[in-house]
């Protein structure tokens, strides 16, 4: 029986050109995590394997960094990075747990946008 739950950062936003950490945490289970896969819609971004360590898909090598922990850091964000991200925990003996994060990449931060139009 699968008793674990995945906690994620949920819906997050970041500024274009900046970076963001995607983080998931598996709790409420004693199952051994053998591998965590990170996917963006139908694209494999990275894999963290308990034995082999990290593998970053070559097409994302310039913009994806492993960690912290089992998380993933996305750098040099573009508006095209907006969308769903999934952390897929492969565990033994439980099986597979999946967490979802929605990232919105904004053209500019609300704070900057507001400051630009302040009346002196």
């Amino acid at each position: 029986m699968m008793t674990g739950t995945i906690e994620t950062t949920g819906n997050i936003s970041a500024e274009k050109g900046g970076s963001i950490i995607l983080q998931c945490h598996l709790s409420s289970t004693t199952a051994q995590v053998t591998q965590v896969n990170w996917e963006q819609q139908d694209q494999l971004l990275a894999i963290c394997n308990a034995d082999l360590g990290w593998h970053i898909s070559p097409s994302f090598k310039d913009r994806v960094a492993p960690g912290p922990g089992l998380g993933l850091t996305l750098q040099s964000l573009t508006v095209n990075d907006t969308g769903e991200y999934f952390c897929i925990y492969h565990t033994y003996p439980d099986g597979t747990y999946t967490g979802r994060i929605f990232l919105e990449v904004l053209e500019s931060s609300v704070a900057e946008h507001g400051a630009r139009f302040q009346i002196p």
């Epitope: 053998t34 694209q43 034995d51 003996p93």
Partner: antibody, heavy 118, light 107 residues
Amino acid sequence: EVQLLESGGGLVQPGGSLRLSCAASGFTFSSYAMHWVRQAPGKGLEWVSGISSNGGSTSYADSVKGRFTISRDNSKNTLYLQMNSLRAEDTAVYYCARVPYSAWIDYWGQGTLVTVSS
Amino acid sequence: DIQMTQSPSSLSASVGDRVTITCRASQSISSYLNWYQQKPGKAPKLLIYAASSLQSGVPSRFSGSGSGTDFTLTISSLQPEDFATYYCQQSYSTPLTFGGGTKVEIK
């Protein structure tokens, strides 16, 4: 250099048994999932079985479930496939394969031929 | 089980031709799709993994694309050593399954 060397193939009668071995070298065997894939003469590739790096998790094709057993000895860098109740349709070249990240086969052995015939 | 359908089953081409092989999965497999090349009497060789990642040491004339259910292997300029049989394989779930193969022959 990664090397996978299968052995144990041969001619066996229907209902008989064989044990295939795959000796691995050139990499940390205990860190990789390993699989068996077979190819009947003139046919395509068919996945047979897989085992996790520590041997704790195994999986089988429906066509061999209950008859074949995959195992590994990490201290000997060796993968095994125990094949019982063999049938004519099990005739094939059997390949041992290394599977990083449980996602693709990056190295294959040269294969060993199993012929099941009376 | 996830069925993998490859097309065409065979094709004839000349050196220098651009060759495209397609593979369709019976359900979405994200990008867990790999391509192998096999020559007669030899073990298969990994060309492309995770749909579009080129395996180390494989010439850049080989490329892969696609996600979900539809995938493509392209050889941009066919070389004499590329005449072989090509297989796709899904690693989204067990049982792992292969396409039926595409034999690339000399025209």
